[in-house]
């Protein structure tokens, strides 16, 4: 985990100021609205499942 | 230093009810989504309940045996959930982890907490 | 509901070898970008523990002995070289939609 400021989160993860961590990519498809997701925006959308 | 911490549990009669507890610290409880995860020699590893983050309006899901049975809710403010359990079954019989997720992955578990329904 | 099939059941591997466990999903679990796949260890009277999230993605603090692979339906869990405290039963999950469902398990004895 990377703290702001410092080197960019790893591949596949983006900052969430919310949770104060590099959070991955891939659970955007569960919860789009995570304010991480915005630095995501390189993957293609997927379906959200229930 | 993340923890979840259980308690309930013990033996009861089939047809009772039983409720577990689990106290959360140690991460944004708030915006994790929290789950009951049973497992018994018989089914293994099975996901019981999911309630969602207020961001999700808490929405629930359950596993399709527990459905009518089982009540899972939680409590934000004071970083803890719960599952509510009537008309328990001999085949409910297992350990009971609680677990957070943000989403996906059941990333931190509690101890376990046995529950045995028997006469 | 997607059935999570974990070969072999128990395997023995000699200490500093190879640990192979397999997992095949009954539909595909997989997006063009990302596998909902994940891997967990479970050590007798202790919760489950996660591996590798997303089929790939090391656990923080999982030492990189462990490693996933695997798209769609078929997935992989090695370990390389095994070492003593490797012995655990070893599940794998996925998150491709309600309900999760997890494999049977694969039991790892160290020889």
């Known amino acids: 985990e990377q703290a702001p400021g410092t080197a960019p989160c790893s591949r596949g993860s983006s900052w969430s100021a919310d949770l104060d961590k590099c959070m991955a990519c891939a659970s955007c498809r569960a919860r789009p609205h995570s304010d991480f997701c915005l630095g995501c925006a390189a993957a293609p959308p997927a379906p959200f499942r229930l | 230093q993340v923890q979840l911490q259980q308690s309930g549990g013990g033996l009861v009669q089939p047809g009772g009810s039983m409720k577990l507890s689990c106290i959360a610290s140690g991460f944004t409880f708030s915006s994790y989504w929290m789950s009951w995860v049973r497992q018994s020699p018989e089914k293994g590893l099975e996901w019981v309940a999911e309630?969602?983050?207020?961001?999700?309006?808490?929405?629930?899901h359950y596993a399709e045996s527990v459905k009518g049975k089982f009540t899972i809710s939680r409590d934000d403010s004071k970083s803890r959930f719960f599952l509510q359990m009537n008309n328990l079954r001999a085949e409910d019989t297992g350990i009971y982890y609680c677990?957070?997720?943000?989403?996906?992955?059941?990333?931190?578990w509690g101890q376990g907490t046995d529950l045995t329904v028997s006469s | 509901d997607i059935v999570m099939t974990q070969t072999p059941a128990s395997l023995a591997v000699s200490l500093g070898q190879r640990a192979t466990i397999s997992c095949r999903a009954s539909q595909s679990v997989s997006t063009s970008t990302y596998s909902y796949m994940h891997w967990y260890q479970q050590k007798p009277g202790q919760p489950p523990k996660l591996l590798i999230k997303y089929a790939s993605s090391l656990e923080s603090g999982v030492p990189a002995r462990f490693s996933g692979s695997g798209s769609g339906t078929d997935f992989t869990l090695n370990i390389h070289p095994v070492e003593e405290d490797d012995t655990a039963t070893y599940y794998c999950q996925h998150s491709w939609e309600i309900p999760y469902t997890f494999g049977g398990g694969t039991k790892l004895e160290i020889k």
């Open positions: 309630i969602r983050s207020k961001s999700d309006n808490y929405a629930t």
């Open positions: 677990s957070s997720t943000y989403a996906d992955y059941f990333h931190y």
